[in-house]
C-alpha cells in the first residue's frame, strides 16, 4: 500500500495505490483511491508512467481528456467514470502487454488540494494448474498442467503423507512455448504415486504462485486449485 500526500501550496490530499500484477493478454486494473470531492468537475486524474513521455490517461471536468495520451496506451485505458466522485481513480488497462510493466503515478487534483502515489505494476502470465491421474502411463502417475506462464516458473511437488520429501527425482517438468511466442504451457509429471494420499503441484514465478491439489483414494478423486498474486502491497 502506497499512500502519497500533496506538497503544494494548497492542502494535500491522501492518494492510495496498491502494487499489482497484470496477466498478459487479459485486462488489468491499476488501483488508486483518493479523498473524494463533492463536485466531479473539480476532480482531475492523471495517470503517468515512468519513462513514458505522454500521459497514460487523463480525466478532468467530468470526462476523459486524451489529447496528450501516449501512443502505447491508445484505445486501451479507461477510468470508472461513475466511481470517480466517490474517490476511485483506478484505471482499467485492456489487453495487458509485457511492456506495460513499470512504475505508474496516480496524480489527483481536487478542490481540497493535490496528491499522488506511485504503483509498481508487474506483468507476466499465470494460470490455474489442473492435476489429473494419467491413466495412459504404465505406473500410477499424476499429470499437472497449466496453460500460460511467464517468466518460466519453478514446479515443485509435495505430498501430505511424505511431508518434506523431495520429488524432483520422480518427476519430470517441461515447458512448451505457446503460439504467441511469449507464454508457455507447463506440464509436470509425477511418477510412483501411492493411493490414499494428497499430492500438490506448486507452480511459482516472481508474479504468482498457484497450487493444484489432488486427493486419490480407492473410491474417489478430489481436486482443488488456487492462485495467489505475490507482492500485492499498497502504497
Amino acid at each position: 500500500l502506497i499512500i502519497g500526500f500533496g506538497i503544494s501550496g494548497r492542502h494535500s490530499i491522501t492518494v492510495t495505490t496498491v502494487a499489482s500484477a497484470g496477466n498478459i493478454g487479459e485486462d488489468g486494473i491499476l488501483s488508486c483511491t483518493f479523498e473524494p470531492d463533492i463536485k466531479l468537475s473539480d476532480i482531475v486524474i492523471q495517470w503517468l508512467k515512468e519513462g513514458v513521455l505522454g500521459l497514460v490517461h487523463e480525466f478532468k471536468e467530468g470526462k476523459d481528456e486524451l489529447s496528450e495520451q501516449d501512443e502505447m496506451f491508445r484505445g486501451r485505458t479507461a477510468v470508472f467514470a461513475d466511481q470517480v466522485i466517490v474517490g476511485n481513480a483506478s484505471l482499467r488497462l485492456k489487453n495487458v502487454q509485457l511492456t506495460d510493466a513499470g512504475t505508474y503515478k496516480c496524480y489527483i487534483i481536487t478542490s481540497k488540494g493535490k496528491g499522488n502515489a506511485n504503483l509498481e505494476y508487474k506483468t507476466g502470465a499465470f494460470s490455474m494448474p489442473e492435476v489429473n491421474v494419467d491413466y495412459n502411463a504404465s505406473s500410477e502417475t499424476l499429470r499437472c498442467e497449466a496453460p500460460r506462464w511467464f517468466p518460466q516458473p519453478t514446479v515443485v511437488w509435495a505430498s501430505q503423507v511424505d511431508q518434506g520429501a523431495n520429488f524432483s527425482e520422480v518427476s519430470n517438468t517441461s515447458f512448451e512455448l505457446n503460439s504467441e511466442n511469449v507464454t508457455m504451457k507447463v506440464v509436470s509429471v509425477l511418477y510412483n504415486v501411492t493411493i490414499n494420499n494428497t499430492y500438490s503441484c506448486m507452480i511459482e514465478n516472481d508474479i504468482a504462485k498457484a497450487t493444484g491439489d489432488i486427493k486419490v483414494t480407492e473410491s474417489e478423486i478430489k481436486r482443488r486449485s488456487h492462485l495467489q498474486l505475490l507482492n500485492s502491497k499498497a502504497s
Epitope: 493478454g25 487479459e26 485486462d27 505522454g54 490517461h57 470526462k63 476523459d64 481528456e65 486524451l66 489529447s67 496528450e68 495520451q69 501516449d70 501512443e71 491508445r74 484505445g75 486501451r76 485505458t77 479507461a78 482499467r92 485492456k94 489487453n95
Partner: antibody, heavy 119, light 107 residues
Framework: QVQLQQSGPGLVQPSQSLSITCTVS????????VHWVRQSPGKGLEWLGV???????DYNAAFISRLSISKDNSKSQVFFKMNSLQADDTAIYYC?????????????WGQGTLVTVSA | NIVMTQSPKSMSMSVGERVTLSCKAS??????VSWYQQKPEQSPKLLIY???NRYTGVPDRFTGSGSATDFTLTISSVQAEDVTDYHC?????????FGSGTKLEIK
C-alpha cells in the same frame, strides 16, 4: 446528444480518390477515437481504421497504403481519404465512435455514405 | 487477422420463440465482442458490448454471453421488429473484425 454526420460524394471514378468528412457533436475529439467501417453490398462489416484522441492512427493493414485519416479538433471534424478506388470498393462507408475509451463496441454511427465506384 | 464466424447464416422463427445466434472467434478475444442489429437502409445499432453488457435502451429480451472464442446472442422471445440482420464484432486486437452476419426471418 452524441451525433456523427457524414458528407461526401456518392460516385467515384475508378482509380480516383474518395474523401468523406465526419462532423461530430455531443462529445470532444480529444476524448474519443473515431473509427471508419465499410459495408459492401450483401457483405459484412469491415473495419478500416481509427484516429485516436491524440491524433495518432491505426489502419487495417489491407488498406494502409491507400488510406489516410486526419482531424480538426476545433471544428469537430474527422477526414477520411482513400486513394485508387476500384469497383470492389463500392460500399457504404460509416464513421463510428466507441462506447468507452477502451473500445468495447461502436455505440454511435454516422448515417453512412453510399459510394459507388464506376466509370 | 481474427476471423469471426457467425452461424447460422439465416434462420426463420415464429414470434415468441427463443432465438440463439452464435459467433466464434478464430482465437481468444477475451470479452471484447459486441453485437449489432442492422435494419435495411439503416446504420448498425449496438445491442451488446463487452460480450454481455446490454447497451442503454436495448430491450432485456436481448442477452449476450460467452468469453474467449465462443459467444452467443439470445433473444428470449422474438418480436416482429427483431426481424433483420445481426452482426458480431471483436475489438480485442487489430484489425478489428466482424462476422458476416445472420439474417433473422419470420415464418
Amino acid at each position: 446528444q452524441v451525433q456523427l454526420q457524414q458528407s461526401g460524394p456518392g460516385l467515384v471514378q475508378p482509380s480516383q480518390s474518395l474523401s468523406i468528412t465526419c462532423t461530430v457533436s455531443g462529445f470532444s475529439l480529444t476524448s474519443y477515437g473515431v473509427h471508419w467501417v465499410r459495408q459492401s453490398p450483401g457483405k459484412g462489416l469491415e473495419w478500416l481504421g481509427v484516429i485516436w484522441s491524440g491524433g495518432s492512427t491505426d489502419y487495417n493493414a489491407a488498406f494502409i497504403s491507400r488510406l489516410s485519416i486526419s482531424k480538426d479538433n476545433s471544428k469537430s471534424q474527422v477526414f477520411f481519404k482513400m486513394n485508387s478506388l476500384q469497383a470492389d470498393d463500392t460500399a457504404i462507408y460509416y464513421c463510428a465512435r466507441d462506447i468507452t475509451t477502451i473500445v468495447e463496441g461502436f455505440a454511435y454511427w454516422g448515417q453512412g455514405t453510399l459510394v459507388t465506384v464506376s466509370a | 487477422n481474427i476471423v469471426m464466424t457467425q452461424s447460422p447464416k439465416s434462420m426463420s422463427m415464429s414470434v415468441g420463440e427463443r432465438v440463439t445466434l452464435s459467433c466464434k472467434a478464430s482465437e481468444n478475444v477475451g470479452t471484447y465482442v459486441s453485437w449489432y442489429q442492422q435494419k435495411p437502409e439503416q446504420s448498425p445499432k449496438l445491442l451488446i458490448y463487452g460480450a454481455s453488457n446490454r447497451y442503454t435502451g436495448v430491450p432485456d429480451r436481448f442477452t449476450g454471453s460467452g468469453s474467449a472464442t465462443d459467444f452467443t446472442l439470445t433473444i428470449s422471445s422474438v418480436q416482429a421488429e427483431d426481424v433483420t440482420d445481426y452482426h458480431c464484432g471483436q475489438t480485442y486486437s487489430y484489425p478489428f473484425t466482424f462476422g458476416s452476419g445472420t439474417k433473422l426471418e419470420i415464418k
